[in-house]
C-alpha cells in the first residue's frame, strides 16, 4: 500500500513560521500577510515505526522538492539537515532511520523527536531568523513545541 501523506505548515510555540534559508536550511521567523506565502509546506508521511496513542512515526518532506529533514551525527553531535533524495523512491513506508521523527502530541502542541536520537527534538531559537535545529533539551530556552496547519493538496 502507498504511504499516506498530508500537506501542512508548522509554526513554533511563539508563532514563528518556517522558511527556506539557502538550499539546505530552514529558519524560523514571524511572518504576516502576504509574507506567509514564503513558509515551507511539508509533506508529512506516516511511516513504519513504533506507534502509540500520542506518538506517531512520520517523515517530513518539503512539498514539491526532493528534500527531507534528516538527523545524522556530525562532529559527534546529532544534527538536523535537509537531505536530497531520489523522488522515484520517496516517500516510502519503510524510511531510513535518519528520516523518522516521532510526532508527539501533548496539550494540543506537537513535538518532533528524532527516532534515531531519542530525546533530541526539532527546535527553534527564541531569536528571530535563526536556523531550525536538533536540540537535546525541552522546556528550556529553545522551543520544541509546534502547531500544525493543514494545507489542501
Amino acid at each position: 500500500a502507498p504511504v499516506r501523506s498530508l500537506h501542512c505548515t508548522l509554526r513554533d510555540a511563539q508563532l514563528k513560521s518556517l522558511v527556506m534559508s539557502g538550499p539546505y536550511e530552514l529558519k524560523a521567523l514571524h511572518l504576516q500577510g502576504q509574507d506567509l506565502e514564503q513558509q515551507v509546506v511539508f509533506s508529512m508521511s506516516f511511516v513504519q515505526g513504533e506507534e502509540s496513542n500520542d506518538k506517531i512515526p512520520v517523515a517530513l518532506g518539503l512539498k514539491a522538492k526532493n528534500l527531507y529533514l534528516s538527523c545524522v551525527l556530525k562532529d559527534d553531535k546529532p544534527t538536523l539537515q535537509l537531505e536530497s533524495v531520489d523522488p522515484k523512491n520517496y516517500p516510502k513506508k519503510k524510511m531510513e532511520k535518519r528520516f523518522v521523527f516521532n510526532k508527539i502530541e501533548i496539550n494540543n502542541k506537537l513535538e518532533f523527536e528524532s527516532a534515531q536520537f531519542p530525546n533530541w527534538y526539532i527546535s527553534t531559537s527564541q531569536a528571530e531568523n535563526m536556523p531550525v535545529f536538533l536540540g537535546g533539551t525541552r522546556g528550556g530556552q529553545d522551543i520544541t513545541d509546534f502547531t500544525m496547519q493543514f494545507v489542501s493538496s
Epitope: 513504519q48 531510513e96 532511520k97
Partner: antibody, heavy 120, light 107 residues
Framework: QVQLVESGGGVVQPGRSLRLSCAFS??????????VGWIRQAPGKGLEWVAH???????SYADSVKGRFTISKDNSKNTVYLQMNSLRAEDTAVYFC????????????WGQGTLVTVSS | DIQMTQSTSSLSASVGDRVTITCRAS??????LSWYQQKPGKAVKLLIY???KLHSGVPSRFSGSGSGTDYTLTISSLQQEDFATYFC?????????FGQGTKLEIK
C-alpha cells in the same frame, strides 16, 4: 573490546530452516543508535547485506530474503538471531554479523562468519 | 536499489605503489559511503566511513574521497599487508548495497 561470534551454520536441504546466532560482547544492543546486521558472501563472490536490527527493534531486510528470513535480538543474552526459512541453493554463503551505530551505517566490527550450505 | 560498481575486479601492484580503487553509485549517495578490507580467514575491517573519515587504528596511508556518484579509496604507499580485497558500501538508501570488490594482488 568488541567481539562478535557467529554460530549455527551447516548443511541443510532446500526448503528447510536454519537459525544463526550472533553472540556479541563489548557493547549493548539496548544503547540508543546501536545496530547489528547480517551480511553474507557466496563462494567466490562479493558481500551482500541481508538484514539489520536496531536497538529499538526496528528491522530491515534485503528483497532477496524478505518474507523468508527474520532477524531478532535477545538483549539479556547479547545475541542477535537470523531465522532462515524456505532456504534455497542461492542462500549458500558465509554469513557474517557486524555492528554499526546510527544511520547511515558503517559496519565497525565484524565476526569471522559461519558457513551455510543449502544442498540436496 | 542503488547499484555500486567497482569496475576493476582485480588490480596488480607492487609494494610502495600508489593505488586507487574506484566505486561508482547508480545515483547520488550524499557521501554515505564506507570502505572495507577483507583478507582470507580474517574479520572484515572498516577503513573509511562517510567518504573520507579514517576509522580509528587505520594507517594514514589510506584515504578516501569523492562526492555524488563517484568515490575513490587511495593507498598512498602500498605495504605488504595491504594485499587484500576491498569493498565499498552505500548507506544512502535501503537496501544497503556493496560493490563487487576489488582484489589487490602482488605484481
Amino acid at each position: 573490546q568488541v567481539q562478535l561470534v557467529e554460530s549455527g551454520g551447516g548443511v541443510v536441504q532446500p526448503g528447510r530452516s536454519l537459525r544463526l546466532s550472533c553472540a556479541f560482547s563489548g557493547f549493548s544492543l539496548s544503547t540508543s543508535g546501536m545496530g547489528v546486521g547480517w551480511i553474507r558472501q557466496a563462494p567466490g563472490k562479493g558481500l551482500e547485506w541481508v538484514a539489520h536490527i536496531w536497538w529499538d527493534g526496528d528491522e530491515s531486510y534485503a528483497d532477496s530474503v524478505k518474507g523468508r528470513f527474520t532477524i531478532s535480538k535477545d538483549n539479556s543474552k547479547n545475541t542477535v538471531y537470523l531465522q532462515m526459512n524456505s532456504l534455497r541453493a542461492e542462500d549458500t554463503a558465509v554469513y557474517f554479523c557486524a555492528r554499526n551505530r546510527y544511520d547511515p551505517p558503517w559496519f565497525v566490527d565484524w565476526g569471522q562468519g559461519t558457513l551455510v550450505t543449502v544442498s540436496s | 536499489d542503488i547499484q555500486m560498481t567497482q569496475s576493476t575486479s582485480s588490480l596488480s601492484a607492487s609494494v610502495g605503489d600508489r593505488v586507487t580503487i574506484t566505486c561508482r553509485a547508480s545515483q547520488d549517495i550524499s557521501n554515505y559511503l564506507s570502505w572495507y578490507q577483507q583478507k582470507p580467514g580474517k574479520a572484515v575491517k572498516l577503513l573509511i566511513y562517510y567518504t573520507s573519515k579514517l576509522h580509528s587504528g587505520v594507517p594514514s596511508r589510506f584515504s578516501g574521497s569523492g562526492s555524488g556518484t563517484d568515490y575513490t579509496l587511495t593507498i598512498s604507499s602500498l605495504q605488504q599487508e595491504d594485499f587484500a580485497t576491498y569493498f565499498c558500501l552505500q548507506g544512502k538508501m535501503l537496501p544497503w548495497t556493496f560493490g563487487q570488490g576489488t582484489k589487490l594482488e602482488i605484481k
